[in-house]
């Protein structure tokens, strides 16, 4: 959970000839306020959709009258944020609409009357618990000048809100496989719970209750192969039921990215690699100087000082892209180990271990004996994340509580009878028949076969087996 | 913090080859996984040859047979032997580490080193 906050500087005449007209006059004074709509990364820009992420509406503006003669300057704006809660995870990629609506305050009857000014949409990549990303749109001869950013509520923390973050239970350290939360190092992570039932191999989470698949796995658990063999065309939604990519148009088709930008496919839709002065999800903002800070994750930003002159972003290691948007594949280096899952959080590397191991690299191989002991004497033997006790004699069982029947399994040779004892069992062996189990047959001449009697001992005397 | 400095680029010929070293400096750290990431003008960074954090090498598809990874612990240094080089070898070429300090992991990058293939 976290909140989304929108911050307009300013709501003006854009550069460039054919400057608006006031919006007020001094027979209708009227004031300002916004509305934002805010939708997961991939979803249409239609204003009419549901605002799924969540909208928010500013408190009205001073009150303005145009004074005659006077071009329209910037619009006073209302104080504070504009602020828009979201439940679940931040997802990293987002499409908003800001509407800039005018109150006209004349005599009307019925009350004031409301008009749409300007709207602008666009589509964002931000990561939570950054800082202040500061953008320009356009909206005919209008230009609205805003910052926005995303944070975290506690306890979550992370670039999507999905890390939870609990009081350390004891001083000294937090659980196995859970790291502190920087930068509350007294806090520790909170176990990342996916939906019950979700594949530990093909499926993972990066919130409470979720399965997602991973390339090549279908269903709601990722539990299914997909399997493109009696399919068609090898690319469309895939169908839950049959695990087939069911045919449909590709992501690239038709070139979604504007202004020259290249599109390839990625596994749940596409991304646009961008020329130099263009970003967002299509490449479709333009005009942007190094003032507006187009470089994200911390690039810098070099040249660029008007709208006709390309910026470059300088990205930080480990960001790519022409605003420093795309982060490497850092997981393509094998970091964890034992079989673990890696995921890219962006903030950092997460290993999902596989049952049996942990750690931050699922290093460590479970002490699966700690906790565990075995009974009457047995010793526990751990191995693939399972334990198992190695019973005394006399003893079995998986925790060696049960008494053995150290006869139950026949072991006297040759007609032996044999007999349970405390340290073990005693054959009594039959008339010619000699050793711990009868094993060697006693030779007419009174000599046995190997090994020889004990001295002590007399052929069909009872053996006992320590 | 850990410091990673490879050498080793420069202007080579299709076919020739050229050895690239990154040599890991720092206090009380330990190297997980480590290898050479690449990138070319206008193009992604990717993974060109590592050990991962079991020890094991691993190649992408397009140096295989070509480039061969190795390391030195003492020196906590890896190398990359690069033979039959191409054209489409051009690019900066980065040494990357994920790298155990205490109890936590960090991922390092170096600054690249240029290397260019060209007649």
């Known amino acids: 959970a976290g909140v989304f906050e929108l911050q307009i500087h300013s709501f003006g005449p854009g550069p460039g000839p054919g400057a608006p007209r006031s919006p007020c006059s001094a027979r209708l004074p009227c004031r300002l306020f916004f509305r934002v709509c805010l939708k997961p990364g991939l979803s249409e820009e239609a204003a009419e959709s549901p605002c799924a992420l969540g909208a928010a509406l500013s408190a009205r503006g001073p009150v303005y009258t145009e004074q005659p003669g006077a071009p329209a300057p910037d619009l006073p704006l209302p104080d504070g944020l504009l602020q828009v809660p979201f439940r679940d995870a931040w997802p990293g990629t987002f499409s908003f609409i800001i509407e800039t609506w005018r109150e006209e305050l004349g005599d009307q009857i019925g009350g004031p009357a409301w008009s749409l000014l300007a709207r602008v949409a666009g589509r964002r990549r931000l990561a939570a618990g950054g800082p202040w990303a500061r953008d320009i749109q356009r909206a005919g001869a209008w230009e609205l000048r805003f910052s926005y950013r995303a944070r975290c509520e506690p306890p979550a923390v992370g670039t999507a809100c999905t890390r939870l973050c609990r009081p350390r239970s004891a001083p000294s350290r937090c659980g196995p496989g859970l790291r502190p939360c920087a930068p509350l190092e007294d806090e520790c992570e909170a176990p990342l719970v996916c939906r019950a039932g979700c594949s530990p191999e093909h499926g993972f989470c990066e919130q409470p209750g979720e399965c997602r698949c991973l390339e090549g796995w279908t269903g709601p658990l990722c539990t299914v192969p997909v399997s493109t063999s009696s399919c068609l065309s090898p690319r469309g939604p895939s169908s839950a039921t049959t695990g087939c990519l069911v045919p449909g148009p590709g992501p690239c088709d038709g070139n979604p990215c504007a202004n020259g930008g290249s599109c390839s496919e990625t596994p749940r839709s596409f991304e646009c690699t961008c020329p130099r002065g263009f970003y967002g999800l299509r490449c479709e903002v333009s005009g942007v100087t190094c003032a507006d800070g187009p470089c994200f994750n911390g690039g810098l930003c070099v040249g660029g000082a008007d709208p006709d002159s390309a910026y470059i972003c300088h990205c930080p290691p480990g960001f790519q892209g022409s605003n420093c948007e795309k982060r490497v594949d850092r997981c393509s280096l094998q970091p964890c180990r034992n079989g673990g899952l890696c995921l890219d959080l962006g903030h950092a590397l997460r290993c999902r271990c596989r049952a049996g191991f942990a750690g931050p690299r699922c290093e460590h191989d479970l002490d699966d004996c700690a906790g565990r002991a075995c009974a009457n004497g047995g010793t526990c033997v751990e191995g693939g994340g399972a334990h198992r006790c190695s019973c005394a004699l006399g003893f079995g069982g998986r925790d060696c509580r049960e008494r053995a029947d150290p006869c139950a399994a026949r072991p006297c040779a040759h007609g032996g009878r044999c007999y349970a004892h405390f340290s073990g069992l005693v054959c009594a062996c039959a008339p010619g028949y000699m050793g711990a189990r009868c094993e060697f047959p006693v030779h007419p001449d009174g000599a046995s076969a190997l090994p020889a009697a004990p001295p002590g001992l007399r052929p069909g005397d009872p053996q006992r087996y320590l | 913090e850990v410091q990673l400095v490879e050498s080793g680029g420069g202007e080579v010929q299709p076919g020739g080859s050229l050895r690239l070293s990154c040599a890991a400096s720092g206090s009380d750290f330990s190297i997980n996984a480590i290898g050479w990431y690449r990138q070319a003008p206008g193009k992604q960074r990717d993974m060109v040859a590592g050990f991962t954090g079991e020890g094991v090498t691993t190649y992408a598809e397009s140096v295989k047979g070509r480039f061969t990874i190795s390391r030195d612990n003492a020196k906590n240094t890896v190398y990359l032997q690069m033979s039959s080089l191409r054209a489409e070898d051009t690019a900066v070429y980065y040494c990357?580490?994920?790298?155990?300090?205490?109890?936590?992991?960090?991922?390092?990058w170096g600054q690249g080193t240029l290397v260019t293939v060209k007649p």
């Open positions: 990357a580490a994920d790298v155990k300090i205490g109890g936590d992991y960090e991922w390092f």
